[in-house]
């Protein structure tokens, strides 16, 4: 019950973060004009990692996306590269995990291959949380960059002034939302992994023999080993000796013509 | 790179008129939106009025609603500035400014011209 339970409830954090990281990716306000110590302007930028856009004074707002791949900075590229990977696997996660859910039965699927494709999901999580985080991560380094470069730039004097980047731009809403988000996919990934733990099946028995005399009758008896698969709390192998009578486990005496000799 | 020269400035009684003028060379600054600020002796810098970059939007100070009017002619790659009913706090050193309005995943530039002194007696 507990495995089931972690389990959904990292596919729904997952799930929760992913649309997160795809609303972050899709969304225009990834810097945004710093008004802090500024001349009054009656425009006001915001860009996104797809478009520029302005909303001037009177409420008029206009984008305008960005139709060149070569003129771009390398490391806006870098941050694109990184959020559409952690989106792509956060996708097929997904995909893979509905599958793995313990509450959902497809054919005969056993609990070892669901409890392979939950780990797997798991790690698809872990990985594009960890990619939306450092997109996010990479593009605030870049505005902090930039802001402190703009800010030299603003206290300049008025003598032959020909200022560039004197607008600064500071953190927008995006980049919190991609923070969370990638922090959600990636606590969702490490539910999924622990879950993954109680899915895959707590004994593999192998059916064994114990020989020894009774009397002059010799006894054997099916299932005298058992072997775990080390999830569980019996992690040595034992041999049990019962004069031939009883096994460990009652629900292994088989009753069988091979019984006595 | 864009540089941008003022002209128009000069010496004008009160409640007289003047008009500025913005050229711009290096690029045409058909995209970039132009503001006209102004700086007075010991003061900070006061924005003054603004145009987009299609020659709408015009948006102005409280101080100069109703007397200043910008206006743009791309074509010329000028700006120009309209005061009518100057008052003496008028006088500043006026200085145009272009800001790109659409910058490619960075901050927009920023150009500014040396400015021209505007003075209002009374």
């Known amino acids: 019950m507990a495995v089931t339970a972690c389990q959904g409830l990292g596919f729904v954090v997952s799930l929760i973060g992913i649309a997160g990281i795809i609303a972050a990716t899709c969304m225009d306000q990834w810097s945004t004009q710093d008004l802090y110590n500024n001349p009054v302007t009656a425009v006001f930028n915001y860009q996104g990692l797809w478009r520029s856009c302005v909303r001037e004074s009177s409420g008029f707002t206009e984008c305008r996306g960005y139709f060149t791949l070569l003129g771009l900075p390398a490391m806006l590229q870098a941050v694109r590269a990184l959020m559409i990977v952690g989106i792509v696997l956060g996708a097929i996660g997904l995909l893979v995990s509905i599958f793995a859910l313990k509450c959902i039965r497809i054919g005969s699927m056993e609990d070892s291959a669901k409890a392979n494709m939950t780990l797997t999901s798991g790690i698809m999580f872990i990985v594009s949380g960890l990619c939306a985080i450092a997109g996010v991560s990479v593009f605030a380094n870049m505005l902090v960059t930039n802001f402190w470069m703009s800010t030299a730039n603003m206290y300049t004097g008025m003598g032959g002034m020909v200022q560039t980047v004197q607008t600064r731009y500071t953190f927008g809403a995006a980049l919190f939302v991609g923070w969370v988000a990638g922090g959600l996919t990636l606590i969702g990934g490490v539910m999924m992994c622990i879950a993954c733990r109680g899915l895959a099946p707590e004994e593999t028995n192998y059916k064994a023999v114990s020989y020894h005399a009774s009397g002059h009758s010799v006894a054997y008896k099916p299932g005298g080993f058992k072997a775990s698969t080390g999830f569980g709390s019996n992690t040595k192998n034992k041999k049990i000796y019962d004069g031939g009578a009883r096994t460990e486990d009652e629900v292994q005496s088989y009753p069988s013509k091979h019984d006595y000799v | 790179e864009v540089q941008l020269v003022e002209s128009g400035g000069g010496l004008v009684q009160a409640g007289g008129s003047l008009r500025l003028a913005c050229a711009a060379s290096?690029?045409?600054?058909?995209?970039?939106?132009t503001n006209w600020y102004r700086q007075a002796p010991g003061q900070q810098r006061e924005f003054v009025a603004f145009?987009?970059?299609?020659?709408?939007?015009?948006t102005y100070a409280d101080s100069v609603k109703d007397r200043f009017t910008i206006s743009r002619d791309n074509a010329a790659n000028t700006v120009y500035l309209q005061m009518n009913s100057l008052k003496p706090e008028d006088t500043a050193i006026y200085l145009c400014?272009?800001?790109?309005?659409?910058?490619?995943?960075?901050?927009?530039?920023?150009?500014w011209g040396q400015g021209t002194q505007v003075t209002v007696t009374s």
């Open positions: 400014n272009a800001h790109e309005r659409f910058p490619m995943g960075r901050p927009p530039y920023d150009y």
């Open positions: 290096g690029r045409a600054i058909g995209t970039y939106d």
């Open positions: 145009i987009n970059y299609r020659g709408g939007g015009a």
